[in-house]
Interface confidence: low
């Protein structure tokens, strides 16, 4: 039933300053929520290029309401980079979710509808902690 | 996972500061992340992240909720995790006085083209 197809809402959450100061690393979290059915492919793009290193994505989407057969789903992913890379304001981070709104097999056979395909993205820009030094700034630029 | 250093951090939405998620990270592989008993709180399974360029691996899980009383300090209460793993972020490190001071004392930066 194509009336039940819901594309995801996507948000990117910026690293905690506590993590940056404690570990010198920065984790961005991407959250895709409210989609049905559970056909999504999530990818991270940094400065326009897809990245795989430092990425971990949930092995499968989570039902938002486990008791419901046609519950909507959510999926999260993490991207971890060095603190200096995150603190370079020139660096652009994008979480892209490709959504395929496929319906069940028998419904496909009957209505022969095309899949509802959609790309939904959210983004963040690197953010200097304001009190940066030329050394940390240069490191961020060099590692970009 | 070498040198586990378990911590829970609160992350803010890049577009709206009133939304946040909780990140439980850097815990050892023996730690199990339990689902919440509250159906309005979502907790993911743990996954392993590999920062190949830094030869560094870490475990992590994420929790979030739309509930107004949801807090990162107790988001992972059903999991057996060490005390004091929640690291609250400072309000902001973008303090005008600090910024002025760093530009005063770092003359190299003053002459760099930041465009």
């Amino acid at each position: 039933d194509l009336n039940k197809v819901f594309p995801p809402e996507v948000a990117v959450f910026e690293p905690s300053e506590a993590e940056i100061s404690h570990t010198q690393k920065a984790t961005l979290v991407c959250l895709a929520t409210g989609f049905f059915p559970d056909h999504v492919e999530l990818s991270w793009w940094v400065n326009g290029k897809e990245v795989h290193s430092g990425v971990s994505t949930d092995p499968q989407p989570l039902k938002e309401q486990p008791a419901l057969n046609d519950s909507r789903y959510c999926l999260s992913s993490r991207l971890r980079v060095s603190a200096t890379f995150w603190q370079n304001p020139r660096n652009h981070f994008r979480c892209q979710v490709q959504f395929y709104g496929l319906s069940e097999n028998d419904e496909w056979t009957q209505d022969r509808a095309k899949p509802v395909t959609q790309i939904v993205s959210a983004e963040a820009w690197g953010r200097a902690d304001c009190g940066f030094t030329s050394v940390s700034y240069q490191q961020g630029v060099l590692s970009a | 996972i070498q040198n586990p250093d378990p911590a829970v951090y609160q992350l803010r939405d890049s577009k709206s500061s009133d939304k946040s998620v909780c990140l439980f990270t850097d815990f050892d592989s023996q730690t199990n992340v339990s689902q919440s008993k509250d159906s309005d709180v979502y907790i993911t399974d743990k996954t392993v992240l590999d920062m190949r360029s830094m030869d560094f691996k870490s475990n992590s899980a994420v929790a979030w909720s739309n509930k107004s009383d949801f807090a990162c300090a107790n988001a992972f209460n059903n999991s057996i995790i060490p005390e004091d793993t929640f690291f609250p972020s400072p309000e902001s490190s973008c303090d005008v006085k600090l910024v002025e001071k760093s530009f005063e004392t770092d003359t190299n930066l003053n002459f760099q083209n930041l465009s």
Epitope: H39, Q60, L102, N105, W108, T109, R112, A113, K114, P115 | -
Partner: nanobody, 117 residues
Amino acid sequence: EVQLVESGGGLVQPGGSLRLSCAASGEVHKINILGWYRQCPGKERDMVATITIGDATDYADSAKGRFTISRDEAKNMVYLQMNSLKPEDTAVYFCRALSRLYPYNYWGQGTLVTVSS
């Protein structure tokens, strides 16, 4: 898991024809859509044609009228008949399966098609 193996690529002259085959194995009951995609050197992978289990087809503009996608459900095969080939059709052609159950996305290793005189 679903495994996909393509065959049928090769060298063909402009205006010629070629038929690509893709054999699907494994958990094929999960598949909802099969498709052909192509990747030219230094470019992104682009959709060429897709077919659903209800036999609804979809084609890229560049493939309409020249290419035909079909499938043989009994043999778990999907085919791409390519006619009136042009040099710009030169690419690695990939078979892709979309599954109804996560993870939805499977790719074959690709087969090279070269259109040249």
